[in-house]
Amino acid sequence: AITEAREEAKPYPLFPGPFPGSLQTDHTPLLSLPHASGYQPALMFSPTQPGRPHTGNVAIPQVTSVESKPLPPLAFKHTVGHIILSEHKGVKFNCSISVPNIYQDTTISWWKDGKELLGAHHAITQFYPDDEVTAIIASFSITSVQRSDNGSYICKMKINNEEIVSDPIYIEVQGLPHFTKQPESMNVTRNTAFNLTCQAVGPPEPVNIFWVQNSSRVNEQPEKSPSVLTVPGLTEMAVFSCEAHNDKGLTVSKGVQINIKAIPSPPTEVSIRNSTAHSILISWVPGFDGYSPFRNCSIQVKEADPLSNGSVMIFNTSALPHLYQIKQLQALANYSIGVSCMNEIGWSAVSPWILASTTEGAPSVAPLNVTVFLNESSDNVDIRWMKPPTKQQDGELVGYRISHVWQSAGISKELLEEVGQNGSRARISVQVHNATCTVRIAAVTRGGVGPFSDPVKIFIPAHGWVDYAPSSTPAPGNADPVLII
């Protein structure tokens, strides 16, 4: 259905009062041309008076006809002043004006609340030429009005550098209540009061609100919008919605679920991402959060060895990113690992326990009693040591790494030798004479290289010197022993 508004052709207005056209104008036009009583006011002033008229919608053309008669004032005819219609209905209204044929290229534009309406609107201008004047009818139609079409519409016509403006057409769109604020899903503490808000607007006003909980009305008497519902507390999940009523009917908001906060479910899928000798990187999939965000998680670690004392190590971490590196573990050991997370209500149960192992460690102790002596006859340096006391978790000894550094006259070079695990001695060739050789030894397992022994230095003289007594690992307190004989 289209509401069509035409110009007044009756002595009384189609829509309220004087806007437009319920009375004749306050002034009479300059020339007594026959016209409908619905013309807009035309300001009277002397034809010889220069300048533009005081009223913006009237233009006095300065051009005269062959008989030098001044032309009448130009003004839009009165049309409907106020249209009330329901949302989604169609509407058509128009402006019309009669323009002397001496004017060319007249265009009419439509404006709404001070802004020109361009583009996607159905505006049609029709021209009906006669001998002396052309009747112009500008129609504006909206096929399915929305609330946003509410407003004051006017026509404007540019002619001879004058702007002629119509009186406004007020378009008031009414419809079912429109929600500006709907209740929101919430997670609440058991038996604790909370509020829900619902706000809807017309037109038409007023809008009344009924609250619905689990399909049953909460309030017998409607409340004026906006309405705040205070729920004293819930013991189980509930669904709330609100109904907004006005004269056009009823609109129902979305239903929102109100959840009761609970302790989280335990994490699942705890898995080992990476193991080293002394750390294990784990990840987990958080369980259901109990409608309350996780605050932090706790990683519980206990030795899986039946002979261990069963103590539990606890590591606290943030809830994100569901990843934690457990440190300070023993090498080559078995552990049971569980994860628990908490929200504001409390801690979850612990996840299913998983078994994890650390890898072999590097030796924790350096070889002992390192001695170094020069065998001048073979031009070698002999090195001896004692195997370090390895722990089981340090893994199986696979050999030794010997570092020997040769320093002479500002030049220094370091060489590394690898020795199999069975030996406790090694021989290295003299690299430079008249130099100091500094030796350090480290034990090696599959877990890595252990700490190096304290350095032992020996001076290698030029050829022809006597034999040497050995240099050995320093006694405590001697930082840098050098034995020269």
């Epitope: 829509f15 009375l23 807009q40 009223t55 919608n57 106020h82 001070g114 006017i154 406004p168």
Partner: antibody
Amino acid sequence: QVQLQQSGPELVKPGTSVKISCKASGYSFTSYYIHWVKQRPGQGLDWIGWIFPGNRNTQYNEKFKGKATLTADTSSSTAYMQLSSLTSEDSAVYYCARLGLIYALDYWGQGTSVTVSS
Amino acid sequence: DAVMTQTPLSLPVSLGDQASISCRSSQSLENSNGHTYLHWYLQKPGQSPQLLIYRVSNRFSGVQDRFSGSGSGTDFTLKISRVEAEDLGVYFCLQVTHVPFTFGSGTKLEIK
């Protein structure tokens, strides 16, 4: 939000004129009618007339023709009412009001008191 | 002119009571569009009039649901279901169907 701000109180002599203003904000001034209403102390309300600022068309209550002149300045979004040949009968509070989309005077200025006294 | 006769001139009430104000027009206020342009205003002491009800029965934005309007043609009523202290003042009806617009003479709502 829509607001109409009127000029301050006036004390004027009989036989003179006074021009009071009504500055609009919060909406398109050229799109809505401005109406003027008179209220004498302890009395009812009297409708004076309207102006449509978009084209400066006016409509007057016969009672106030020749007494009131309505104008508008779109550049400052201000409507004016000039009262001429003042007498003690013109002593009153004058209100401007906007005719809203609902075709009611939905927003009013705070009023301007005019006192005519010798 | 459409003459608006408002009764009573003064209405003493107790807080919490219902109040009813009548407005009668000398001619029908229904326009040819089927709408009736009769509005109700409240003017509190020292303030401008404020719109309560538009077109007979529509509450203006922000107006409490204690206020309701009814009527048609020439007879109209404003009801306040439970009077509160903030409701005190002078109530006017206004018709905008016919020019000139005309107001009722006002009803002063006061405490008994």
